[in-house]
């Protein structure tokens, strides 16, 4: 007698960060033969899907056509085989962006620095928010939190070439409602490659990491399909 079913995977396409009024699809992947999938939002049943035919489908999609702050929050999904339900998936934090205002991102001493220099990013937003988020675009979009009345500091410490890349920041009105993104700031780090080749990727962002998403400036926020399992630490919890 089967007593447990593996928990399903949950993710958002194209991304967990969704501009307001844009569409997003929440995907839930369980097992072939699953009779029913349930999507739960903030602990309550949000939607149900029954794949047809169950034996040929192991993934369902829940479409949100018009993202807004009421739809932002924590989602999880479960599925059943017969009358046996799986464990719930990990929580997916769906964030609505492009709310209210646009912060300004600046970097000190400047966007071109030498390896070993101390670098600090400043994210400023004059409206009522006290939490700021700094994201580095790339294979794993690292997120760092900062706090301040109208401005947050993000000290990177002595930088290496691993810090090279494009950064954006957001103001956060609550855990799941973020501002428009700032204009991107490209950090260029020059220095001795030998000394930095063994440095871990983005060493200043060890605590808050989503190792799952690819951010691109042209198309907005894209999911990295090679790393789709939403397993990394969750900034919002």
């Amino acid at each position: 007698q089967q007593q447990t079913l593996p928990k399903p995977f949950i993710w958002a396409e194209p991304h967990f960060m969704v501009p307001k009024e844009k569409q997003v699809t929440i995907c839930c992947q369980g097992n072939y033969g699953a009779v029913e999938y349930q999507l739960h939002f903030e602990g309550s049943l949000f939607a149900v899907d029954r794949p047809k035919p169950p034996e040929r489908i192991n993934k369902v999609k829940f479409y949100i056509p018009d993202m807004n702050s009421r739809m932002a929050g924590q989602y999880s999904c479960i599925y059943r085989v017969g009358e046996l339900w799986s464990e719930p998936s990990n929580l997916l934090d769906l964030v609505v962006t492009e709310m209210y205002d646009t912060p300004t991102l600046s970097v000190h001493p400047g966007p071109e620095v030498i390896s070993g220099e101390k670098v600090t990013f400043y994210c400023r937003l004059d409206t009522a928010t006290s939490m700021f988020l700094l994201l580095k675009e790339g294979r794993s979009s690292h997120v760092q939190r900062g706090y301040g009345k109208v401005q947050a500091e993000f000290p990177l410490g002595p930088v290496t070439t691993a810090h090279r890349g494009t950064y954006r920041c957001f103001g956060s009105y609550n855990n799941h409602a973020w501002s428009f993104p700032s204009e991107p700031v490209k950090l260029l780090v020059t220095g001795d490659i030998e000394n930095t080749s063994l440095a871990p990727e983005d060493p200043t962002f060890p605590a808050d990491t989503w190792g799952t998403y690819l951010l691109t400036t042209e198309t907005g926020l894209q999911k990295d399909h090679a790393l789709w399992d939403h397993t990394a630490q969750n900034l919002l919890r």
Partner: antibody, heavy 117, light 107 residues
């Protein structure tokens, strides 16, 4: 072995409430859903609803939704079904049933609830 | 709600007879169907799950078949202990619903 032991027969007046218990043993209580099914005298089977004891999530037959509450106590591996605003047509045997990957695989012995003025 | 229509509602048969009970769902239930046997004063007992799979300890003279909306329970050679009422039930959606039952009586 899996056992579902239900509370004893009840006689209730119309308008009253009844709470039937179902103590599970022989398996991990939180790994399986618990359903409730009733059977009026000489009639067929009618599904009332279920609870996932792990999460407390419940789902009900719309017919009973306003009058039924299904709960579970993980510490005692016991499920409960409470039916309120009883009427004579609620006279039935009420069964708790374990839900597994095979469907309704183990049933309690049944509890007769008689509603009579 | 999905309606389950079971037929016949009763039948008379002799020991050794082949007995067939059918169940029709009001929509495709994708083989999410179970069959139960119930004897007077007792709780139902699972015979078949997922339309065709025999539950543990159920004699091989019982078999289930069907797909889509139409399903059948067959008893290949009726035994004295098989005289009972049989129910089909779907577990495709909510609410789960049962057929009206088929009473198998001794001829």
């Amino acid at each position: 072995q899996v056992q579902l032991v239900q509370s004893g027969a009840e006689v209730k007046k119309p308008g009253a409430s009844v709470k039937v218990s179902c103590k599970a043993s022989g398996y991990t209580f939180t790994s399986f859903t618990m359903h409730w099914v009733r059977q009026a005298p000489g009639q067929g089977l009618e599904w009332i609803g279920y609870i996932n004891p792990s999460s407390g999530y419940t789902e009900y037959n719309q017919k009973f939704k306003d009058r039924t509450t299904i709960t579970a106590d993980k510490s005692t591996s016991t499920a409960y079904m409470e039916l309120s605003s009883l009427r004579s047509e609620d006279t039935a045997v009420y069964y708790c049933v374990r839900g597994s990957s095979r469907g309704f695989d183990y049933w309690g012995q049944g509890t007769l609830v008689t509603v009579s003025s | 709600d999905i309606q389950m229509t079971q037929s016949p509602s009763s039948l008379s048969a002799s020991v050794g007879d082949r007995v067939t009970i059918t169940c029709r769902a009001s929509e495709n239930i994708y083989s999410n169907l179970a069959w139960f046997q119930q004897k007077p004063g007792k709780a139902p007992k699972l015979l078949v799950y997922a339309a065709t799979n025999l539950a543990d300890g159920v004699p091989s003279r019982f078999s289930g078949s069907g797909s889509g909306t139409d399903y059948t329970l067959t008893i290949s050679s009726l035994q004295p202990e098989d005289f009972a009422t049989y129910y089909c039930q779907h577990f495709w959606g909510t609410p789960r619903t049962f057929g009206g039952g088929t009473k198998v009586e001794i001829k």
